[in-house]
């Protein structure tokens, strides 16, 4: 995912000026760049700390430049270094005087493991001293004096990694100042295999791109792309994308372009020499001009892009029919995503020809991680990759980077990401009303932890103690009404904030518990009291069917009128009637009953009733006759309270007549308090009697009452208040 | 602020009647629930009664069902309490007090009521 | 109705000494519905404690709640001067009724 180059400008040192430039091209490392003196490579090097500037003209590219009064300090071994995910990917290259006795054949080179090697060093001066070749500093081959040839070879027949390393030639009299440096790459695996066992099939890399052993993937050389280097870049561009530009007059001239591993360095296509200031010769092209161009149908030879295909051919040598290649281009995505945390599915769209398949795009996080698409579908024009983050974070904002690989060309897109965190609040909602069916609720949804703004918010509630799912409503404002709740149960609430964007769904707050009021069942119907002797009381109901499963019980409230006496009982709730006991005969009580779950109901309205008498009532008073007629006459008269009087009984006879003659009326509501005799004699007189009657036995009449009929015509005298029977 | 303050309290003989008020402010008023709290001399607090904000709707306790009845003016932020056929042993400090979470989170200074022959 | 007893009735200690005071439910008070009020000679009562364990605002951290269930504990750690006053607790888990304890008194030594 790094795309990191380093520039060698020139890696043969005159008095001119000299630089190193190290760009980490479309990629925004989290850790700086650095250029460095390469100990490992040659340990008696200048000791000297370089001075290392930022690239005006790149956003991410160092420099070091040496004045030509500095070409002294400068001989030695470096490298560029970047890292990614703390992993380091590491350019090396090497600066030697122009002057230098011996001249490699090339900065480095690249063999495979196995292959026949020879490093060469071209005499440059003649010297009559031994010549002496180093490996990283130490001595491994000599030549005499007078054999040293124009060509000076090590010879490696089987190389292998560990023969890997900066070889170094000059005469034995000479120094580090006149040694001539090349570098031998040693890939790890065999010609065209790469992974951790060497069994895997490199892809064809052309146009002289190396297969990198680790991870199959062709190193492109500068000017060429995509994933087999096959696509040629727009003039004096570089980079895996070709979105470096060389700025000088003639391109990228003079620039000696070091890869990572296994590549090395070579000159950008169309150019050749150490210093790669050398035009290619015609019909070559590429790195170093290594590249030969075999036309077909006599079409143009670029010496940077090679063969100039006429439309409907493609190849290198322009030697397959079919549709013109085209590089891939990402679109539809924004330069900025405003993501939420939590699962994220990026989609990475492009166009191109041939289209992109699913490994040829990948996504890029920050910290240099390689995504690979969990789905991907393509239509005629488009390939969609879908990639799968399960769970993105606020550290992982930053530019992302849509990466697409194909033969045709290679293009990336970076693009920020802004992960917010999801808002939850900090405070439980409040409960400020409720009742036994509803709750009114402050949602509290300020103050909240993360990020804003609110787009909507949701309170959520359920019962505690039932397996119920929560219950949403949507809300508006802070305050918020539930309704048709149930009476004397537990509730819990929270609150969840939703900010825009997909899964903007933040956790629900702190949760609240609450009790709605308990509401009383109603009180027993047909509540009835009676006495049943001097002792108790009855009291009755009709039998309760309870709406809910809860355990209920009728709970009985009796007190004395006379006396400050109060006694509560519990009644199970399957039975219709309890007896009031241990009272006191001729007393007034007063009785009321709820019926109670575990919470209390409603009392009923007070029933009175008085225990029976233990004594004989006492006598009606205040008897009258009234409403006397030839034929009638109306009796009325009150009883005493508390005497248990269950009937009054009215005896009437003509006066003088036999005891035995006598009329009885018996009126057996003891409430009431008037009666009219009916079918008298005219002018009679009569002797009428009046007592009462309880459970102990009737009261005694002190004396008799006289009544006189009138004669036929007269009208009838006044009738007196109170309840009659007729 | 929140500020409670009760006012009508005084003396009576037994069955006779008094209505205390309760003026709220800094807060809003009708949506909370209300209650009244009273405090017997040298005795322990006892919940009294309570009217809901939203639809009035009232609680009492047992021993003042049936002779106290709850209140509230809602445009004025007032409850009120009507005590009648007062006992002796209604005689106490009355506090209005506002309901949060069914725990009273601010209090009045308290009336007296103070019923004897 | 819950029926709340508070003990001891009276609670006799020294400035900076420790203060524990227990309210004993009748019935379980599911999830911590209890509260604790302070009150001073001639006062309204004051919040402490709700939801058994929760400050109410502006309550120094001195005061503490605890308990579930049936019992509960209002801790005062380092008794001031201004701490020696009555304690209320009180259930709003089962109501109506909404009930007091009988209070805790304490009293400087």
């Known amino acids: 995912a790094m795309d990191l180059i380093l520039i060698n400008s020139l890696p043969l040192v005159s008095d001119a000026e000299t630089s190193l430039t190290c760009i980490a091209s479309g990629w925004r490392p989290h850790e700086p760049i650095t250029i460095g003196r390469d100990f490992e490579a040659l340990m008696n090097q200048h000791q000297d700390p370089l001075e290392v500037t930022q690239d005006v003209t790149r956003e991410w590219a160092k420099k070091v430049v040496w004045k030509r009064e500095k070409a002294s300090k400068i001989n030695g071994a470096y490298f560029c270094e970047g890292r990614v995910r703390g992993e380091a990917i590491r350019i090396r290259t090497m600066k030697m005087r122009q002057q230098a006795s011996f001249l490699p054949a090339t900065l480095t080179m690249t063999v495979d493991k196995g292959d026949n090697v020879n490093i060469s060093f071209k005499k440059v001066l003649i010297k009559e001293e031994d010549a002496v070749i180093y490996k990283n500093g130490s001595f491994i081959h000599s030549v005499p004096r007078h054999e040293v040839p124009d060509i000076l070879e090590v010879h490696l027949p089987h190389a292998q990694p560990q023969d890997a390393g900066v070889y170094s030639a000059r005469y034995i009299g000479g120094n580090l100042f006149t040694s001539a440096f090349t570098r031998l790459i040693v890939r790890r695996c065999e010609a065209q295999k790469w992974g951790p066992e060497c069994n895997h099939l490199c892809t064809a890399c052309m146009n002289n791109g190396v297969c990198h052993e680790d991870t199959g993937e062709c190193i492109c050389p500068p000017g060429f792309m995509g994933r087999t280097c096959e696509k040629a870049c727009e003039l004096h561009t570089f980079g895996r994308t070709c979105k470096e530009r060389c700025s000088g007059q003639e391109g990228c001239k003079s620039y000696v372009f070091c890869l990572p591993d296994p590549y090395g360095c070579s000159c950008a296509t169309g150019w050749k020499g150490l210093q790669c200031n050398e035009a290619c010769h015609p019909g070559f092209y590429g790195p170093d001009c290594k590249l030969r161009c075999s036309c077909n149908n006599g079409e143009m030879c670029d010496r940077f892009q090679g063969c100039l295909c006429s439309p409907g051919w493609q190849g290198l040598q322009c030697e397959r029919e079919g549709i013109q290649r085209m590089t891939p281009k990402i679109v539809d995505l924004p330069d900025h995503i405003e993501v939420n945390s939590g699962k994220f599915n990026p989609i990475c769209k492009a166009s191109g020809w041939p289209l992109p398949t699913n490994e040829e795009m990948t996504l890029v996080k920050p910290d240099g991680t390689v995504l690979h698409p969990k789905d991907f579908n393509h239509t005629d024009h488009f390939s969609v990759a879908i990639f799968t983050i399960h769970r993105i974070l606020p550290p992982d904002s930053g530019v992302w980077v849509c990466s697409v690989n194909t033969v045709a060309g290679m293009v990336e897109k970076p693009f920020n990401i802004s992960v917010k965190v999801l808002p939850k609040p900090l405070n439980a909602p409040n409960v400020i009303d409720t009742g036994h069916n509803f709750a009114v609720i402050n949602i509290s949804s300020e103050p909240y932890f993360g990020d804003g703004p609110i787009k909507s918010k949701k309170l959520l509630y359920k019962p505690v103690n039932h397996y119920e799912a929560w219950q949403h409503i949507q809300v508006t404002n802070e305050i918020v009404t539930l309704n048709y709740l149930e009476p004397r149960t537990e509730y819990e609430l929270c609150v969840q904030l939703v900010r825009r964007g997909e899964g903007g769904e933040g956790h629900p707050g702190p949760v609240r518990r609450f009790t709605t009021a308990s509401i009383g069942l109603p009180p027993p119907r047909g509540l009835n009291l009676l006495p049943k002797s001097q002792t108790t009381l009855n009291l009755t109901w009709q039998p309760i069917f309870p709406s809910s499963e809860d355990d209920f019980y009728v709970e009985v409230e009796r007190r004395s009128v006379q006396k400050s006496d109060q006694q509560n009982i519990k009644v199970p709730g399957n039975l219709t009637s309890v007896l009031l006991n241990n009272l006191h005969p001729r007393e007034q009580y007063v009785v009321r009953a709820r019926v109670n779950t575990k919470a209390q109901g409603e009392w009923s309205e007070d029933l009175t009733a008085w225990t029976l008498s233990d004594i004989l009532p006492p006598q009606p008073e205040n008897i009258k006759i009234s409403n006397i007629t030839h034929s009638s006459a109306v009796i009325s008269w009150t009883i005493l309270d508390g005497y248990s009087i269950s009937s009054i009984t009215i005896r009437y006879k003509v006066q003088g007549k036999n005891e035995d003659q006598h009329v009885d009326v018996k009126i057996k509501n003891a409430t009431i308090t008037q009666y009219q005799l009916k079918g008298l004699e005219p002018e009679t007189a009569y002797q009428v009697d009046i007592f009462a009657e309880n459970n102990i036995g009737s009261s005694n009449p002190a004396f008799s009452h006289e009544l006189v009929t009138l004669p036929e015509s007269q009208a009838p005298a006044d009738l007196g208040g109170g309840k009659m029977l007729l | 602020d929140v500020q409670l303050v009760e006012s009508g309290g005084g003396v009576v003989r037994p069955g006779e009647s008094l209505r205390l008020s309760c003026a709220a402010s800094?807060?809003?008023?009708?949506?909370?629930?209300m209650n009244w709290v009273r405090q017997a001399p040298g005795e322990g607090l006892e919940w009294v009664s309570r009217?809901?904000?939203?639809?009035?709707?009232?609680y009492y306790a047992d021993s003042v069902k049936g002779r106290f009845t709850v209140s509230r003016d809602n445009s004025k932020n007032t409850l009120y309490l009507q005590m009648n056929n007062l006992r002796a042993e209604d005689t106490a400090v009355y506090y209005c007090?506002?309901?949060?979470?069914?725990?009273?989170?601010?209090w009045g200074l308290g009336t007296l009521v103070t019923v004897s022959l | 109705e819950i029926v709340l007893t508070q003990s001891p009735g009276t609670l006799i200690l020294s400035p900076g000494e420790r203060a524990t005071l227990s309210c004993r439910a009748s019935?379980?008070?599911?999830?911590?519905?209890l509260a604790w009020y302070q009150q001073k000679p001639g006062q309204a009562p004051r919040l402490l404690i709700y939801?058994?364990?929760n400050r109410a605002a502006d309550i120094p951290d001195r005061f503490s709640g605890s308990g579930s269930g049936t019992d509960f504990t209002l801790t005062i750690t380092r008794l001031e001067p201004e701490d020696f006053a009555v304690y209320y607790c009180?259930?709003?888990?089962?109501?109506?009724?909404?009930?007091f304890g009988g209070g805790t008194k304490v009293e400087i030594k």
């Open positions: 007090a506002k309901t949060l979470n069914n725990f009273f989170d601010y």
């Open positions: 800094g807060f809003s008023f009708s949506l909370y629930a």
């Open positions: 009217i809901s904000g939203r639809d009035g709707y009232t």
């Open positions: 019935q379980s008070i599911s999830n911590t519905y």
């Open positions: 939801d058994a364990s």
């Open positions: 009180q259930q709003y888990y089962d109501w109506p009724p909404l009930t």
